[in-house]
Amino acid sequence: MMTGTIETTGNISAEKGGSIILQCHLSSTTAQVTQVNWEQQDQLLAICNADLGWHISPSFKDRVAPGPGLGLTLQSLTVNDTGEYFCIYHTYPDGTYTGRIFLEVLESSVAEHGARFQIP
């Protein structure tokens, strides 16, 4: 029985040209995590394997960095980076857990404008 739950950073927004950290956390299970995959829609961004370390997909190599922890840092954001991101935890013996993050990349002026009206 799969008892674990994935907590994520949820829906996040960032400014075009900036960077963002995608993070998930698996809790409520004693299953051993063996690998975490990061995907954007159906495209693989990165893999972190317990024995082999990180592999970043060649198409993202210049603007994706591992960390912090099992998270992923996306740099030099463009509006095309807007969309769903998934962290896929491969565990033993539970199997696979998936978390979802929605990222919206905003034009600089929009991000600045929106920030003025945030509730403290």
Epitope: G53, W54, I56, K61, R63, G67, G69, Q75
Partner: antibody
Framework: QAYLQQSGAELVRSGASVKMSCKAS????????MHWVRQTPGQGLEWIGS????????NYIQKFKGKATLTTDTSSSTAYMQISSLTSEDSAVYFC??????????WGQGTTLTVSS | DIVMTQSQKFMSTSVGDRVSVTCKAS??????VAWYQQKPGQSPKPLIY???YRNSGVPDRFTGSGSGTDFTLTISNVQSEDLAEYFC?????????FGGGTKLEIK
């Protein structure tokens, strides 16, 4: 088995710069973040920053931004840290450490830096 | 920055005893905490990751626990070779930060 070999002790004048190295072996250098940590005599561990050799992406703690520069040479599997504008407060042991699965799992033996006035 | 506080700088224990080293984070770090052991004149050695998982080769007398802001490293059946300083470290966010360390003294 991963292994990190750091360069030897340095005695440097105040105001000068120093560049120390950390040669990695026994694993794929571009698959792991490399971190730098310093320890002053009788004190704790202070994280300086990290670098991902796959694309040289870096992170620094605020106090070392502009003071420490992290680089790598993937052809020789070596990480470097340059520290500028040295003062006596920079005298410490500097460690490089590989970030493995959720911990800094392999550490170099440390490079002792002594800054003289 | 997240501050990791190890309130006890020194702890004294005897061989065979059980001792607990504590670490408090200034904000929620979930279980993104590692523990290290550093013996005099040596580099730090990883003991625990994800707050409670032992690194490879670490004796099972070392146990980590906690989540959120409060973490504990427990050494049961303390041995003379456990004389060392113990550091916690968070990797929830950059910059990574360490606790100030707790030196374990064997009576």
């Amino acid at each position: 088995q991963a292994y990190l070999q750091q360069s030897g002790a340095e005695l440097v004048r105040s105001g000068a710069s120093v560049k120390m190295s950390c040669k990695a072996s026994g694993y794929t250098f571009t698959s792991y973040n490399m971190h730098w940590v310093r320890q002053t005599p009788g004190q704790g561990l202070e994280w300086i920053g990290s670098i991902y050799p796959g694309n040289d992406g870096t992170n620094y703690i605020q106090k070392f931004k502009g003071k420490a520069t992290l680089t790598t040479d993937t052809s020789s599997s070596t990480a470097y840290m340059q520290i500028s504008s040295l003062t006596s407060e920079d005298s410490a042991v500097y460690f490089c450490a590989r970030e493995g699965w959720l911990s800094l799992d392999y550490w170099g033996q440390g490079t002792t830096l002594t800054v003289s006035s | 920055d997240i501050v990791m506080t190890q309130s006890q700088k020194f702890m004294s224990t005897s061989v065979g005893d059980r001792v607990s080293v504590t670490c408090k984070a200034s904000q929620n770090v979930v279980t993104n905490v590692a523990w290290y052991q550093q013996k005099p004149g040596q580099s730090p050695k990883p003991l625990i990751y994800s707050a409670s998982y032992r690194n490879s080769g670490v004796p099972d007398r070392f146990t980590g626990s906690g989540s959120g802001t409060d973490f504990t490293l427990t050494i049961s059946n303390v041995q003379s070779e456990d004389l060392a300083e113990y550091f916690c470290q968070q990797y929830k966010s950059y910059p990574y930060t360490f606790g100030g360390g707790t030196k374990l003294e064997i009576k």
